[in-house]
């Protein structure tokens, strides 16, 4: 699996999406894990909603949640209020059974602030970047919510 | 087992520049970020900035943003640190450290010996 | 930036006695997300580079000697040594681990009677 990366600004949300084909995995639940290391396990972080049909609702850990639009083949996460311990590399899985499937290898970056980034002396945007070795960057940049304000519009 | 070696002290003039080294070895380089540390004679410790050796990403304590660029050469395994603009505030021990945590960027879990700087005319 | 102060700055023991010090950030270390506080203790003993001693506010890092102990939450922290060893002899900074930029307190010196 190649790897791509996203980066996000500390204090920000970060939008993490993991594209799959629809058919190969209709009726599988998804998972959001982290790596502990080359070898090691991936640490389950939150998965979609136990009723496969209900996979759209966003069900969160913590400031991580997860949804899936299981007929576009889509699964996000959000990073809610980023950190930079929550720098590191991650995976977006198919479970099936007490089986996971790896659908996209994601390394998570966190930057002290938006002028940080691999090419210095450019502008940073949000958007996709160019290309290293086997990993592509893309760079997500959304405004942190204000006090009171909901994170997002209530399910139904 | 984990070394970070760094180059050795120098002595600079002011308004020159100083590129320093730390080369990695005992684990996979661009698995674990490389951050840099100053230590100003009998001081605390300040945090320059990082680099993620895999991507070459960067993120830099404001103070440190004009003053330091943080660099890599993954083929060697080796992080550098080029200082500018030098004046006596600059004179310090500079330390790299490797993160703990795997392409995280939490803890100075192994730190190099420290390269030393003396600014003086 | 967060400001991390530590108390006293330096203080003198006898081997074998129990040492505490202090360390207090200006904003909660502690995530809310996943209930962990992000705060590191460092040794630096004379001539040498600081050594990683507690992460996580209270974990010790492998090999650390169990007389030292890491404790609180939120921006109130503790390093206490049991029993205070010659060996003991350093610098101990504890390190916001928060929160960019990263920063440490002004140290706290152990000295030796």
């Known amino acids: 699996h190649n790897t791509t990366v996203f980066q996000g600004v500390a204090g920000q949300s970060l939008q993490v999406s993991c594209p799959y084909d629809s058919m190969k995995h209709w009726g599988r639940r998804k998972a959001w894990c982290r790596q502990l290391g080359e070898k090691g396990p991936c640490q389950r972080v939150v998965s979609t909603h136990n009723l496969w049909l209900l996979s759209f609702l966003r069900r969160w850990n913590g400031s991580t949640a997860i949804t899936d639009d299981t007929l576009g083949g889509t699964l996000t996460i959000t990073l809610r209020n980023l950190q930079p311990h929550d720098a590191g590399l991650y995976q977006c899985q198919s479970l099936h059974g007490s089986e996971a499937d790896t659908l996209r290898k994601v390394l998570v970056e966190v930057l002290a602030d938006p002028l940080d980034h691999r090419d210095a002396g450019d502008l940073w945007f949000p958007g996709e970047s160019e290309s290293f070795e086997d990993a592509h960057v893309e760079h997500s940049i959304s405004r942190s919510l204000l006090e009171g304000e909901i994170p997002f519009p209530p399910t139904s | 087992e984990v070394q970070l070696q760094q180059s050795g002290p120098v002595l600079v003039k002011p308004g020159a520049s100083v590129k320093m080294s730390c080369k990695a070895s005992g684990y996979t380089f661009t698995d674990y970020y490389v951050h840099w540390v100053k230590q100003s004679h009998g001081k605390s410790l300040e945090w320059i900035g990082l680099?993620?050796?895999?991507?070459?990403?960067?993120s830099y304590n404001q103070r440190f943003r004009v003053k330091a660029t943080l660099t890599v050469d993954k083929s060697s395994s080796t992080a550098y640190m080029e200082v500018n603009s030098l004046t006596s505030e600059d004179s310090a021990v500079y330390y790299c450290?490797?993160?703990?945590?795997?392409?995280?960027?939490?803890?100075?879990?192994?730190w190099g010996q420290g390269t030393l700087v003396t600014v003086s005319a | 930036d967060i400001v991390m102060t530590q108390s006293p700055s330096s203080l003198s023991v006898s081997a074998g006695e129990k040492v505490t010090m202090s360390c207090k950030s200006s904003?909660?270390?502690?995530?809310?997300?996943?209930?962990?506080?992000?705060l590191a203790w460092y040794q630096q003993k004379p001539g040498q580079p600081p050594k990683l001693l507690i992460y996580?506010?209270?974990t010790r890092e492998s090999g650390v000697p169990d007389r030292f102990t890491g404790s609180g939450s939120g921006t109130d922290f503790t390093l206490t040594i049991s029993s205070v060893q010659a060996e003991d002899l350093a610098v101990y900074y504890c390190q916001n681990d928060h929160s960019y930029p990263y920063t440490f307190g002004g140290g706290t010196k152990l000295e030796i009677k």
């Open positions: 996580g506010a209270s």
């Open positions: 680099i993620n050796p895999y991507t070459g990403t960067t």
């Open positions: 904003q909660s270390l502690l995530n809310s997300g996943n209930q962990k506080n992000y």
């Open positions: 450290a490797r993160s703990r945590v795997y392409y995280g960027s939490s803890l100075f879990a192994f």
